[in-house]
């Protein structure tokens, strides 16, 4: 399956979403920190990123939870995380990012 990411809000700041199995979904902010945000932002071509929490509830799937990156990974998929769709979160806990060049 092809996977991609997007920011919902402005071009560089807002809710972090991932595309998996034909559907856009959100990331739970459990364990979500700047190391994870840096990797997410790098996937969009940015060099810096910082984590945001409770940025406004999304809808649909919550695809990822307990994402734990070192910050050196090239994609989120290389980071430790729960299996796709496995979480104990609500959309009130949707993670966000602010990315920067």
């Amino acid at each position: 399956n092809s996977v991609s990411v997007r920011i919902v809000g402005s071009s560089n700041r807002g809710r972090a979403e991932v595309y998996y199995s034909g559907t856009w979904g959100t990331i739970c902010d459990d364990e979500w920190d700047n190391s994870d945000a840096i990797v997410f932002c790098r996937m969009l071509g940015y060099s810096k990123g910082r984590a945001l929490s409770s940025v406004g509830a999304g809808t649909g799937q919550i695809w990822l939870d307990n994402v734990q990156c070192r910050g050196t990974e090239s994609t989120l998929w290389s980071c430790t995380k729960n299996s796709w769709g496995h979480h104990d979160c609500s959309h009130e806990e949707d993670a966000g990012v602010e990315c920067s060049v």
Epitope: D29, S47, S54, G96, S100
Partner: antibody, heavy 120, light 107 residues
């Protein structure tokens, strides 16, 4: 308009303890990260502590780590700062400030501040 | 810690003029920078975040620019209520740090 009202300041002796409170109103307190920032007399602003909306994450400046504890009670719309082993260099105006979002973020609303004086 | 060096410390200008305040970071902070306004008997106000994004309620005569280590706050066509103290603040890494402030006074 967001309101943040600090209380609990005063004059204390070095080595003693104090607990500051910040009562929030006119916004959904439980959705936002909260911070304590201080300003010593004739000095600049110093961020000292942050707590996430759900209390899951707390961060501190090195100058207060191990001595100060940030906490919150979302049912009471109240932020706290418990200060132990106070030193003269902790003398400052203490402000609570709301984050733009639920965790670490820019400070979009500030209280008027409460003065803490540590002196013998 | 990231050191934030703000200049000038004092600035005198007249209503209607334009002024610029500089803020330099000791390392690259991307665009993770905010500007605040401090006025007596008022609570501190967030003016600009993410380097250049105007906070809701900030007049359009305020603008922010820069990235990396060099940032500028510009106020065009100064109004009487703009005379205040201005601070920059980095939000790239803990601990969040502030500039020492610029006091904008009426000439």
């Amino acid at each position: 308009e967001v309101q943040l009202v600090e209380s609990g300041g005063g004059l204390v002796q070095p080595g003693s303890s104090l607990k500051l409170s910040c009562v929030a109103s006119k916004f959904t307190f439980s959705n936002y990260g909260m911070n304590w920032i201080r300003q010593a007399p004739k000095k600049g602003l110093e961020w000292i502590a942050l707590i996430y909306y759900n209390s899951n994450n707390k961060y501190y400046a090195d100058s207060v780590k191990g001595r100060f504890t940030i906490s919150r009670d979302n049912s009471k719309n109240t932020l706290y700062l418990e200060m132990n082993s106070l030193r003269s260099e902790d003398t400052a105006m203490y402000y609570c400030a709301k984050s733009l979002t639920g965790g670490s973020d820019y400070f979009d609303s500030w209280g008027q501040g409460v003065m803490v004086t540590v002196s013998s | 810690d990231v050191q934030m060096t703000q200049s000038p410390s004092y600035l005198a200008a007249s209503p209607g003029e334009s002024v610029s305040i500089s803020c330099k970071a000791s390392k690259s902070i991307g665009t993770f920078l905010a500007w605040y306004q401090e006025k007596p008997e008022k609570t501190n106000k967030l003016l600009i975040y993410s380097g250049s994004t105007l906070q809701s309620g900030t007049p359009s005569r305020f603008s922010g620019s820069g990235s990396g280590t060099d940032f500028t706050l510009t106020i065009r066509n100064l109004e009487p209520e703009d005379f205040a103290v201005y601070y920059c603040q980095q939000h790239d890494e803990y601990p969040f740090t502030f500039g020492s402030g610029t006091k904008l006074e009426i000439k």
